[in-house]
């Protein structure tokens, strides 16, 4: 469900939302951290009936369903793991 | 302006079947989740099962899932409640409900009910 | 299932007053919480989303908050037309499930 991208590009989000989406509706989250082009972190709500939200990253749902997913990743794997998307 | 009309409803005997129907109108019905909840005379509002677009995801209330089938049909518009083995205590009005997964995540439009009496 | 409480069941409040509702819920609902106003012989109208955003067309006087476990809404204040009885919902997971309901009367 967790991804992070390491991309060259600028900026993808232009409005973004800080509304909570349940997890049944949410196909994948993609995290674009800051750099690059980019002075902020993205995050990238990829939903399942297709279309896809840019999410506030400082929204507290999004904060606190990362952090569910860090520490169920982390009792799992021994390190978190990072897809690299090559630019 | 959007519309969700049920039917179906009515007196039926205890053991008996019934298959509430819904139309809908003014939305683009093939794109959303639709739900089910009902209201038991004096209650409260108890939801029932939810269906996605395209009929691949299905959710029940736990104790109605052997009893209560949930379907939908998009080239018509319509969402349905197949209701088996019917006991005194479905007597309700049953709404059908249009779950956004949009903007709000939840209920925001709502049909203005049918009424099922179990009774003998 | 997650369950809902929803305090007080009912309310007796005059013209004007601040109306607070809570629901305590079960377990961790992130802020999957709405909030319904349904008046008698009618369907439910969605009032508040996401634990704190007001529907489209709903006015300033509606109010909600919190996250987690305890929910708030509020009335900041009532009006006659807001005689009903309001419903908080969880809708994180399924199965989806409502308080029980707080019934507002006016004094």
């Known amino acids: 469900v967790l991804e992070v991208y390491y991309t060259s590009l600028r900026c993808r989000c232009v409005q973004e939302s800080s509304v909570f989406i349940p997890r049944r509706f949410i196909d994948r989250i993609q995290i674009l951290p800051r750099g690059n082009g980019c002075p902020r972190k993205e995050i990238i709500v990829w939903k399942k009936n297709k279309s896809i939200v840019c999410v506030d990253p400082q929204a507290e749902w999004i904060q606190r369903m990362m952090e569910v997913l860090r520490k169920r990743s982390s009792s799992t794997l021994p390190v978190p793991v990072f897809k690299r998307k090559i630019p | 302006e959007v519309q969700l009309v049920e039917s179906g409803g009515g007196l039926v005997q205890p053991g008996g079947s019934l298959r509430l129907s819904c139309a809908a109108s003014?939305?683009?019905?093939?794109?959303?989740?639709m739900s089910w909840v009902r209201q038991a005379p004096g209650k409260g509002l108890e939801w029932v099962a939810e269906?996605?677009?395209?009929?691949?995801?299905?959710n029940y209330a736990p104790s109605l899932k052997d009893r209560f089938t949930i379907s939908r049909d998009n080239a018509k518009n319509s969402l349905y409640l197949q209701m088996n083995s019917l006991r005194a205590e479905d007597t309700a009005v049953y709404y059908c409900?249009?779950?956004?997964?949009?903007?709000?995540?939840?209920?925001?439009?709502w049909g203005q009910g049918t009424t099922v009496t179990v009774s003998s | 299932d997650i369950q809902m409480t929803q305090s007080p069941s009912s309310l007796s409040a005059s013209v004007g007053d601040r109306v607070t509702i809570t629901c305590k819920v079960s377990q961790d609902v992130n802020t999957g919480v709405a909030w319904y106003q349904q008046k008698p012989g009618k369907a439910p109208k969605l009032l508040i989303y996401s634990a704190s955003y007001r529907y489209t067309g709903v006015p300033s006087r509606f109010s909600g908050s919190g996250s987690g476990t305890d929910f708030t809404f509020t009335i900041s204040s009532l009006q006659p037309e807001d005689i009903a009885t309001y419903y908080c919902q969880q809708y994180y997971s399924t199965p989806l499930t409502f308080g029980g309901g707080t019934k507002l009367e006016i004094k």
């Open positions: 269906i996605n677009p395209e009929s691949s995801t299905i």
């Open positions: 409900a249009r779950q956004d997964d949009y903007l709000t995540y939840t209920m925001d439009y």
């Open positions: 003014g939305i683009d019905f093939s794109r959303y989740w």
